[in-house]
């Protein structure tokens, strides 16, 4: 179902419209938005009373509301992924049109603790009770609904339209009818304030078509912050009634002439404005011309005024409004300056912390200090940063380049370093031979030895077995060893898992689940594989299997 404007209340610089219709919060916001507004804010008790008034107006005209407890959307929502925050008055919710986290709230009950779902707020009206200013509608949060499924008891919504100013309603000095058409497409004949850019159609007379006169006016900005219709004198005046009809349309005093004509006047301390109807205070500060926290200060003899701003603010070009002074323009901070309303604060770049001589100074954070180093092995502090390095036989690893990963020399870029079997160890490696072969003195080659069906020479020693579990090479793997590149190992290594470079089939290794620890490695049993078949850490779900190899000389750690 669509939504119809049923009621409108204009006050201050805003108009509130109430609509009936079972719409989702998104559909309701879209409806308000199409006419230049948003779902209504309720940022204060006063605003809550304005909203209550427009809802009361709607309910007087609306006979067919289906639920005793009716709900009307307002513009308070919490986006998907934003958690309920019990420490804030708005509990993590925010106004759809933007704006600060206001202190006023009127929650119906304790809120549901959630983060995943988008949540929306409606005003809860008990239609069995009269709407009283002392009993303002409570805020109820819940799912935001969807087209065709607005949510339980949703009966409508309230929009808010903001304007730079308002005109006073047109004053009729005799019989007639005024029809206002607002910029948000509402027509009304009774507004206590009429928004800027509204049109007024005035039909004078008592319904006799021959006597009807029509006038058309537009609410314009006559001067900064001064809005009027550009009409002069009361409308629809009639000698028949004089001052007796609606006080002649005058704001304060009405003075009749003997011929049935009349004039408007003002009480002491007030003056008649150009429309010859309205009275304004002679004290120029009484109309509160200053905005944005500015104070109105009367000039000599009370004739004019100036606006004064609090510390940290200055007058804008209109000389009526206060704007924040950007203290950061004077560069008062050593590194980063953040301008704040009425002041500023200094911040330090990543890798620095407040300290050192002078106001707003920053000093380097020593990331490598005892107990604070992010690096697995070597750490070098630099100005504003740090970098990690690894011992020989390890390369930098991890997303942020702070971890060290053992280099598997057995599957290095130059192919196997050993003639036959290669055993990788933490930080090193060593060579071994198949049954029936023995390791030559150079520690790399294999020579024919006494025939044996035992395990390959150079099995993992006892000390290592607990760390990387080994298994013997299958007996079927008796192919002659293939020659690897010439050369000697870089150290006399201890043993660990073997990797056989041969034509033997590749065997997959079962994963050994371990109790979780701070820096788990990839644990696998020894496997027979071709020179190209390197098993290693598997790609995480959705991750990237490529690992950039980094030099041992270190790299900048990410902060």
């Amino acid at each position: 179902t669509g939504a119809d404007t049923e009621a409108v209340v204009c006050v201050g610089t805003a108009c509130y419209t109430a609509h009936s219709g079972k719409l989702s919060a998104a559909e309701a916001q879209n409806h308000c938005n199409q006419n230049g507004g948003n779902l209504a804010t309720v940022k204060s008790k006063e605003e809550a009373q304005h909203v209550q008034r427009v809802l009361a107006q709607l309910l007087r005209r609306e006979a067919a509301l289906t639920a005793r407890m009716s709900k009307f959307w307002i513009g308070l929502q919490r986006e998907k992924g934003k958690c309920l925050d019990p420490s804030l008055p708005l509990k993590g919710f925010s106004w759809v049109g933007g704006g600060e986290d206001t202190p006023y709230s009127n929650w119906h009950k304790e809120l549901r603790n959630s983060c995943i779902s988008k949540r929306c707020v409606s005003l809860l009206l008990d239609l069995s009770q009269p709407l009283l200013p002392s009993r303002l509608p409570k805020w109820s949060e819940g799912p935001c609904g969807s087209p065709g499924s607005p949510g339980s008891n949703i009966e409508g919504f309230v929009c808010k339209f903001s304007f730079k100013g308002m005109c006073r309603p047109l004053a009729l000095g005799g019989p007639g009818q005024v029809t206002y058409t607002t910029p948000f497409q509402t027509t009304s004949s009774s507004l206590e304030a009429v928004p800027f850019a509204s049109a007024a159609n005035v039909a004078c007379g008592e319904g006799d078509k021959d006597e009807t006169q029509s006038h058309y006016f537009l609410c314009k900005e006559k001067a900064p912050d001064v809005f009027d219709w550009g009409s002069s004198g009361p409308l629809c005046v009639s000698p028949k009634y004089g001052c007796n009809f609606n006080n002649g349309g005058c704001h304060q005093d009405c003075f009749e002439g003997g011929d049935g004509s009349f004039l408007c006047g003002c009480r002491p301390g007030f003056r008649l404005l150009d429309d010859l109807v309205t009275c304004a205070s002679r004290n120029p500060c009484s109309s509160s011309p200053c905005r944005g926290g500015a104070t109105c200060v009367l000039g000599p003899h009370g004739k004019n005024y100036t606006c004064r701003c609090p510390q940290g603010y200055q007058l804008d070009s209109s000389q009526l409004d206060c704007v924040d002074v950007d203290e950061c323009q004077d560069s008062p901070c050593a590194q980063e300056c953040v301008n704040t309303p009425g002041g500023f604060r200094c911040e330090c770049w990543v890798g620095y912390e407040p300290g050192g001589p002078g106001e707003g100074a920053c000093q380097d954070v020593d990331e490598c200090a005892l107990g604070r180093s992010p690096c697995a092995q070597g750490c070098t502090n630099t100005d504003g940063s740090f970098h990690c390095s690894c011992e020989e036989g390890y390369v930098l690893a991890g997303e942020d380049g702070t971890q060290c990963q053992d280099v598997d020399e057995c599957v290095g870029p130059g192919g196997p370093l050993c003639d036959s079997l290669c055993f990788n160890t933490q930080g090193s490696f060593h060579c071994g031979c198949l049954p029936g072969w023995v390791l030559a003195p150079n520690g790399v080659s294999c020579t024919m030895g006494p025939v044996s069906l035992g395990p390959p020479s150079g099995p993992p020693d006892e000390e290592d077995k607990g760390e990387k579990e080994g298994s013997t090479v299958p007996r079927a793997a008796t192919a002659s060893p293939t020659r690897g590149p010439e050369g000697t190992p870089k150290a006399t290594p201890t043993t660990s898992r073997p990797s056989l470079s041969s034509d033997a089939p590749i065997t997959s290794a079962p994963l050994k689940m371990l109790a979780p620890s701070g820096s788990p490695g990839v644990w696998r049993e020894p496997s027979i594989h071709h020179a190209t078949a390197a098993s290693g850490p598997q790609e995480p779900a959705g991750g990237d299997s490529s690992v950039a190899t980094q030099n041992n000389d270190g790299t900048d750690g990410q902060k």
């Epitope: 998907k80 958690c83 925050d85 019990p86 420490s87 603790n113 959630s114 983060c115 995943i116 779902s117």
Partner: antibody, heavy 120, light 108 residues
Framework: QVQLQQSGAEVKKPGSSVKVSCKAS????????MHWVRQTPVYGLEWMGG????????AYNQNFKGRVTITADKSTSTAYMELSSLRSEDTAVYYC?????????????WGQGTTVTVSS | EIVLTQSPATLSLSPGERATLSCRAS???????LHWYQQKSGASPRLLIY???NLAFGIPARFSGSGSGTDYTLTISSLEAEDVAVYYC?????????FGGGTKVEIK
């Protein structure tokens, strides 16, 4: 008191799917979101995603590239996590968890864990 | 996503000693959204401290937490044998929630 009871251990072949259940008791099922976290020796604890049982709305960790589906059955107060296109690195302990009456995603309640082994 | 780096990977201390565990975030995290968990061998993780410094129900007062921005600390004022476990930090500042790699606390 709040209890989260998970289904038993599973052994699966690579390429297949696994569906782990988590039956909640001791509270109104639709009051709290339900989340899934897995633990592997290589990657430690990884948040997979969560569901709001009241609305059925879900949030997922994009690292799982659409392989995870979380559902909830209000009638049986049970949440489910299905992981498809299994590979060996999905071998892990899978936990359901929620934050009960606490705020800011502080996971107060955990299931006992379900071990899923992916092996050919 | 925000990466949490815990240090040291392993902490070996004698009973009665003070344990200080660090959790560093790759970008700033609201202190309300930084939590610590304890996981003993073969058990599920257990909430230890929520919102940086609040003790979860049933957690002894020797545990405390502090920090802000990118640097957070879990302290065990006087280590006991029953505190042997792996400790994880966790944050939320938009999906995905992430955990640190853990710090293993053992008795010397």
């Amino acid at each position: 008191q709040v209890q989260l009871q998970q289904s038993g251990a599973e052994v699966k072949k690579p390429g297949s799917s696994v569906k782990v259940s988590c039956k909640a008791s001791g509270y109104t099922f639709t009051d709290y979101e339900m989340h899934w976290v897995r633990q592997t020796p290589v990657y430690g604890l990884e948040w997979m995603g969560g569901i709001d049982p009241e609305t059925g709305d879900t949030a997922y960790n994009q690292n799982f590239k659409g392989r995870v589906t979380i559902t909830a059955d209000k009638s049986t107060s049970t949440a489910y996590m299905e992981l498809s296109s299994l590979r060996s690195e999905d071998t892990a302990v899978y936990y359901c968890t929620n934050y009960g009456n606490l705020y800011y995603y502080a996971m107060d309640y955990w299931g006992q864990g379900t071990t899923v082994t992916v092996s050919s | 996503e925000i990466v949490l780096t815990q240090s040291p990977a392993t902490l070996s201390l004698s009973p009665g000693e003070r344990a200080t565990l660090s959790c560093r975030a790759s970008s700033s995290v609201s202190s309300s959204y930084l939590h610590w968990y304890q996981q003993k061998s073969g058990a599920s993780p257990r909430l230890l401290i929520y919102s940086t410094s609040n003790l979860a129900f049933g957690i002894p007062a020797r545990f405390s937490g502090s920090g802000s921005g990118t640097d957070y600390t879990l302290t065990i004022s006087s280590l006991e044998a029953e505190d042997v476990a792996v400790y994880y930090c966790q944050q939320y500042s938009g999906y995905p929630l992430t955990f640190g790699g853990g710090t293993k606390v053992e008795i010397k």
